[in-house]
Structure formats: C-alpha cells, structure tokens
C-alpha cells in the first residue's frame, strides 16, 4: 500500500486548510486513522465503527472531513509544521504519511491542493 | 447519568461458554456511545476484551477474537458478552463500561459495579 | 499489542505530599492515555483523559501530563480517600490495553 498526501501546503493566517491523506494500492481495511503534529499531540482520530475523536485543545478549531481528512480553522504561525496521518488497517498493519504546513502572513498564501507521494 | 449493571451465573464449567448482560439505565443504547466489556483478573490486571458501538457493530480485543461475541438488545437497554470455549484462566472480574469517543476517545467514563465469574469444575 | 508499563507496583507517601506515578508506552501513543483510580471494592473511576485532563467533578490536586510514550500522573497534596490503585490505559489504536496499576499506600 501506498499513502499519498497533499504534501507541502501553504495557507493564510487565520484562514483554513484541508489536510488530506488516501491510502491505495492495498485492499487492506481501514480501522483508524490518526491525526498527529509533529510534537506528538494528537489533533483527532477517526475510528471506522465509533467515529471522529477530537482531541480537546482543538475542538473549537478543527472541523471532521473531508472524508478521513481534517480541516484546520483559524490558522496562526505556530500552525506551521509537519502533521501525521496514520493508517490502521487489516491485515496490513500502519501506514503513516506526511504533510508540511507553512502559514503565512501575506495575504497572497497559495494554498496547493495537488496530492504527491511524499 | 448513565447507570450500568451487569449480571450473569458467577459459576461456569471449563470448555463451556460465559454468558453475560449489561443493563443500560438513563441512556439509550443506540445513541453516540461506546459499550464496552473490560475485565479484571485476580492481581488486579485489565483487560478490555471489546466494545459494541451505538450502530451495533463490534471491535474486540485479538487475543479473544476467536471466542468472543458482543451483542445487544435495543428494546431492553442491554448488550452481552458471550465468551466460549472457558478455561481457569478466564476467573475474573468483568465490568461494563461506556465511553463518549468523540469527546474523550477510548476513555470509559462510567462503570458498572462489576460481576465475579469463577470458571472451576 | 501496545504494553503500557507502570514501574512501581507500589508507592508509599504520607498525607500533603506531592505523589508522582510514571506510566511508559511500548511505541509512540500520541496523548491518547487515561488515568483510572480503582478504591478496594469499586470498579475503576476515569480521572484523566487525553493525557492532561481532568474529567468532570475530578479535584484539580490530579493532574496528568506528557506525550509520546512518557506520561505522568501526579497528585498534589495527597489525602487519605486517595489511598487506591491507579491505572494507565492507552487509546491510540484497538486493542486499547491498561497498564498495571501503582498502589498508593498512605504511610
């Protein structure tokens, strides 16, 4: 299996951004996905029979979806860095993908939405 | 709040299959929680053996898989454990527990008082 | 399976003192760790969710913290009723697994 990711994104301060990762090559179920930053706090996980989980810190800025995805809200500058997904599946076992985010100051933020094999 | 008690024979052969109930009180089954089977061998260790969701599928613990069914019944507030094949080692504590997973993950916020089995020929 | 190692079996202190009680991770678990307080005869009580907080009615002398695969829970000042056993337990991914329990006993 294989994890594609929207890789490098860039997105404006106190704007929004859609963290997305997809899972192919595998006929493996997907149990879980985690969502995670890159000093190991946990931002949400999606269990396939119980649902989204929402870490606390941040329920007032993080929106379920898309699909297994994740939109983060009103972004700041400690925003920037790299976010996790990792795929529990059976039988396969985890997969984990990668995705940097910078948030920028300027008001002309490109935000790219290709997908690439990070 | 939501109350949760289990029942059951205390007294089960080896080689035949424990069977047991939790009663939901104050909560409908088929809302947004989690239904849970925990245990607590003699030494104090846990085990969580699986859950029940509110949409009736199950996960369970893949060290029980093979023996192992959680069901319900949504007109009595109940869901079940049925273990088979029991041995000795299957003499424990069980517990029902319920948890709110969008809210607190897999973090069992309200227990049942808990039922003794003892698998003993 | 992810085993979750709590090192003292058992923790002795006296009434006021601040209590430290480790809980380690076998791999990386993110900040998805309860607390639980088991008292002789009772079924196990959540304390603290998602590493650091307290659940409802929960006295704010228990804290919890840490990440990855450290974590600690500690009581501030500690009080006789919080003579009890207490666990850790991990949700990152099932199966969900407890640690092994730390005895509190009041000197």
């Known amino acids: 299996g294989t994890i594609e990711t929207t890789g490098n994104i860039s997105a404006k301060k106190g704007g929004s951004v859609i963290l997305q990762c997809h899972l192919s090559s595998t006929m493996a179920q997907v149990t879980q996905v985690n969502w995670e930053q890159h000093d190991h706090s946990l931002l949400a996980i999606r269990n396939a029979e119980l649902g989204w989980h929402i870490y606390p810190a941040f329920k007032d800025r993080v929106a379920p979806g898309p699909g297994l995805g994740l939109t983060l809200q009103s972004l700041t500058m400690n925003d920037t860095g790299e976010y996790f997904c990792t795929y529990h599946t059976y039988p396969d076992g985890t997969y984990r993908g990668r995705i940097f985010l910078e948030v920028l100051e300027s008001s002309v933020a490109e935000h790219s939405a290709r997908f690439q094999i990070p | 709040d939501v109350q949760l008690q289990e029942s059951g024979p205390g007294l089960v052969k080896p080689s035949q299959s424990l069977s047991l109930t939790c009663t939901v009180t104050?909560?409908?089954?088929?809302?947004?929680?989690?239904w849970n089977w925990i245990r607590q061998f003699p030494g104090n260790k846990l085990e969580w053996m699986g859950y029940i969701s509110n949409s009736g599928s199950a996960s369970y613990n893949p060290s029980l898989k093979s023996r192992i069914s959680i069901t319900r019944d949504t007109s009595k507030n109940q869901f079940f454990l049925q273990l088979n094949s029991v041995t000795t080692e299957d003499t424990a504590t069980y517990y029902c527990?319920?948890?709110?997973?969008?809210?607190?993950?897999?973090?069992?916020?309200?227990w049942g008082q808990g039922t003794s089995v003892t698998v003993s020929s | 399976d992810i085993v979750m190692t709590q090192s003292h079996k058992f923790m002795s202190t006296s009434v006021g003192d601040r209590v430290s009680i480790t809980c380690k991770a076998s791999?990386?678990?993110?900040?998805?760790v309860a607390w639980y307080q088991q008292k002789p005869g009772q079924s196990p009580k959540l304390l603290i969710y998602s590493a650091s907080y307290r659940y409802t009615g929960v006295p704010d002398r228990f804290t919890g913290s840490g990440s990855g695969t450290d974590f600690t829970f500690t009581i501030s000042s500690v009080q006789s009723e919080d003579l009890a056993v207490y666990y850790c337990?991990?949700?990152?991914?099932?199966?969900?697994?407890f640690g092994g329990g730390t005895k509190l006993e009041i000197k």
């Open positions: 791999q990386g678990v993110s900040t998805t």
């Open positions: 527990a319920t948890l709110i997973y969008y809210d607190y993950g897999g973090a069992m916020n309200f």
């Open positions: 337990q991990h949700y990152y991914s099932t199966p969900w697994t």
């Open positions: 104050g909560y409908s089954i088929t809302s947004d929680y989690a």
